[in-house]
C-alpha cells in the first residue's frame, strides 16, 4: 500500500517538437499505476486504463485539464526566457506524497537537457536554482500572473486533496491484484552449457521477487529483466546459466502480492516450450 | 564577430573597491547567453566570480557573495564587476566571457584578452 | 565546490607523441569542457561535453571520459600544441576549473 500514497505528474516540454508530435506532455501517476495524459495537441486531461472507469465528480477532468494547461504554458514560455534556438527538453516532476500521519509532502523539481536544474521553494514560494538559465526561467515565471501562487495552491491544497480523492474512490483500482503467469524454459547456451529463463506475465503490483532453487536448495536470483506492459501490468524474467544435462535439477520460486503463497515453477518439457 | 574588453584600473590599493568593466561588440548582452567574470591568479589557477544572464538575473561565486556584485548598462553594451575590500589575495587577471549554448550544452566560447589588476599599497 | 584536479601538473612531449592529459573531478559530473590557454593570452574552448571539438580545433585533439574521470588526448604533438589546458565543469554549482597542465615540448 506505501507505494500507492504518491500523486506524480512528469511534465515535458520541447522546444523545437518534430511536425505532428506534441510541444509538451503529461503523465499522471498514482503510485506505480498511470491514470493521466495530457499532450499539447489535444489539450485535453484524460484518465488511463482502468482510471477511466472511477467514479469522479463530474469537474475533476475539467480542473486537471485546466491546471496543465496553466503549466503548458508556463513550460513552453520559458524556452522564451532561454533565448537562442534550442534545441531545449524541459522536464518537470510534480506532486505530492502522503505520509504514515497522512500528511503531505508536495515535490517540485525541474530538468533542462535531463540535468536537474531548478526547485520551487515552498517557503519563499518562488522558483529557484544557480544556473543561469534557471534563474532566467524563475524570472520569467515570477512575471507571470499569480504564476507562484498557482503553483503553491497546486502542490499544497489540489494535489494532496486529489490524491485523497482518488484512494477514496479508485480504492479498487489501487488495490488490483493481477498474479504472474509463469514459465520455466531451458535452452542451450555456451558448450556445456544451459541458460534456464524463469518468466513472469502480466502481473500487478510490480513487486515481484524470482529465484532458483537446485535440488531445493537457494541457487541465487539470476541475471534479471522487468518492464512495464501497456496495459499498465509488468513483465519480469530471471535467468541463470547452469551445467548441461543438469537443468531438471531446478526450479523457480516466485512471491507476488496475487499469490496466496510462494509458486513452485518446474521446467517445461521441450515438448511444450515449442 | 563578437569581441569583449575589460578595462579598469591596474592598481587597487587594499580595502578599496574594484571595478571593472566589459564592454561587448558584435552581440546585444540583452539578446540571449550569459556574461561572465572569471580571474586567474598569479599561480595560473582560474576561478568563476560571477554572471548576469541577458534577462538581468544575477548569481555569484558563495565565496565572494559578500563583496561583490555585477550590473549592466544595456544601452552602451557593458557590464560591470563591483569587488569590494580588497586584498593582496585579490591581484589577477580579470576575464569577462560569454556563455552560450550549442548542442545541448553551456560552455565559455568567447573570452576577453584580461586587463591584469594589482592590489598593493 | 567540486574539486577539480589535473595532472600532470606539467609536462614534456616530443612533437609526434601521443598525449594523455586527465582531470579528476571530486564528485561526479555529467560532462567536462576543455580550455586550451597559450602564453599571454585567454583561455580558448578546446572541447565541449566531453568530446565535442569546438570550431576549428585540430582533429588530432579529443576528449573521454565520465564519471569523476576524464582525459584530454593528443594524438600526435605538434608544436603549437604547447600551452596549459584547463578542464572546467558545469553539472554542481559553482562553476569550477581544474589547475591546468602545463604542456611543454621536449
Known amino acids: 500500500a506505501e507505494s500507492h500514497l504518491s500523486l506524480l505528474y512528469h511534465l515535458t516540454a520541447v522546444s523545437s517538437p518534430a511536425p505532428g508530435t506534441p510541444a509538451f506532455w503529461v503523465s499522471g501517476w498514482l503510485g506505480p499505476q498511470q491514470y493521466l495524459s495530457y499532450n499539447s495537441l489535444r489539450g485535453e486531461a484524460e484518465p488511463c486504463g482502468a482510471w477511466v472507469w472511477e467514479n469522479q465528480v463530474s469537474w475533476y477532468w475539467e480542473k486537471e485539464t485546466t491546471d496543465l494547461r496553466i503549466k503548458e504554458k508556463l513550460f513552453l514560455e520559458a524556452f522564451k526566457a532561454l533565448g537562442g534556438k534550442g534545441p531545449y527538453t524541459l522536464q518537470g516532476l510534480l506532486g505530492c506524497e502522503l505520509g504514515p500521519d497522512n500528511t503531505s509532502v508536495p515535490t517540485a523539481k525541474f530538468a533542462l537537457n535531463g540535468e536537474e536544474f531548478m526547485n520551487f521553494d515552498l517557503k519563499q514560494g518562488t522558483w529557484g536554482g544557480d544556473w543561469p538559465e534557471a534563474l532566467a526561467i524563475s524570472q520569467r515565471w515570477q512575471q507571470q500572473d499569480k504564476a507562484a501562487n498557482k503553483e503553491l495552491t497546486f502542490l499544497l491544497f489540489s494535489c494532496p486533496h486529489r490524491l485523497r480523492e482518488h484512494l477514496e474512490r479508485g480504492r479498487g483500482n489501487l488495490e488490483w491484484k493481477e498474479p504472474p503467469s509463469m514459465r520455466l524454459k531451458a535452452r542451450p547456451s555456451s558448450p556445456g552449457f544451459s541458460v534456464l529463463t524463469c518468466s513472469a506475465f502480466s502481473f500487478y503490483p510490480p513487486e515481484l521477487q524470482l529465484r532458483f532453487l537446485r535440488n531445493g536448495l537457494a541457487a541465487g536470483t539470476g541475471q534479471g529483466d522487468f518492464g512495464p506492459n501497456s496495459d499498465g501490468s509488468f513483465h519480469a524474467s530471471s535467468s541463470l546459466t547452469v551445467k548441461s544435462g543438469d537443468e531438471h535439477h531446478y526450479c523457480c520460486i516466485v512471491q507476488h502480492a496475487g499469490l496466496a503463497q510462494p509458486l513452485r515453477v518446474e521446467l517445461e518439457s521441450p515438448a511444450k516450450s515449442s | 564577430q563578437v569581441q569583449l574588453k575589460e578595462s579598469g584600473p591596474d592598481l587597487v590599493k587594499p580595502s578599496q573597491s574594484l571595478s571593472l568593466t566589459c564592454t561587448v561588440t558584435?552581440?546585444?548582452?540583452?539578446?540571449?547567453?550569459?556574461w561572465h567574470w572569471i580571474r586567474q591568479f598569479p599561480g595560473n589557477k582560474l576561478e568563476w566570480m560571477t554572471y548576469?544572464?541577458?534577462?538581468?538575473?544575477?548569481n555569484y561565486n558563495p565565496s565572494l557573495k559578500s563583496r561583490i556584485s555585477i550590473t549592466r548598462d544595456t544601452s552602451k553594451n557593458q557590464f560591470f564587476l563591483q569587488l569590494k575590500s580588497v586584498t593582496t589575495e585579490d591581484t589577477a587577471t580579470y576575464y569577462c566571457?560569454?556563455?552560450?549554448?550549442?548542442?545541448?550544452?553551456?560552455?565559455?566560447?568567447?573570452w576577453g584578452a584580461g586587463t591584469t589588476v594589482t592590489v598593493s599599497s | 565546490d567540486i574539486v577539480m584536479t589535473q595532472s600532470p601538473a606539467i609536462m614534456s612531449a616530443s612533437l609526434g607523441e601521443e598525449i594523455t592529459l586527465t582531470c579528476s573531478a571530486s564528485?561526479?559530473?555529467?560532462?567536462m569542457h576543455w580550455y586550451q590557454q597559450k602564453s599571454g593570452t585567454s583561455p580558448k574552448l578546446l572541447i565541449y561535453?566531453?568530446?565535442n571539438l569546438a570550431s576549428g580545433v585540430p582533429a588530432r585533439f579529443s576528449g573521454s571520459g565520465s564519471g569523476t574521470s576524464y582525459s584530454l588526448t593528443i594524438s600526435r604533438m605538434e608544436a603549437e600544441d604547447a600551452a596549459t589546458y584547463y578542464c572546467?565543469?558545469?553539472?554542481?554549482?559553482?562553476?569550477?576549473f581544474g589547475g591546468g597542465t602545463k604542456l611543454e615540448i621536449k
Open positions: 566571457a560569454r556563455e552560450v549554448y550549442g548542442n545541448y550544452y553551456w560552455y565559455f566560447d568567447v
Open positions: 558584435g552581440y546585444s548582452i540583452t539578446s540571449g547567453y550569459s
Open positions: 548576469i544572464h541577458s534577462s538581468g538575473s544575477t
Open positions: 564528485s561526479s559530473v555529467s560532462y
Open positions: 561535453s566531453t568530446s
Open positions: 572546467q565543469q558545469r553539472s554542481s554549482y559553482p562553476y569550477t
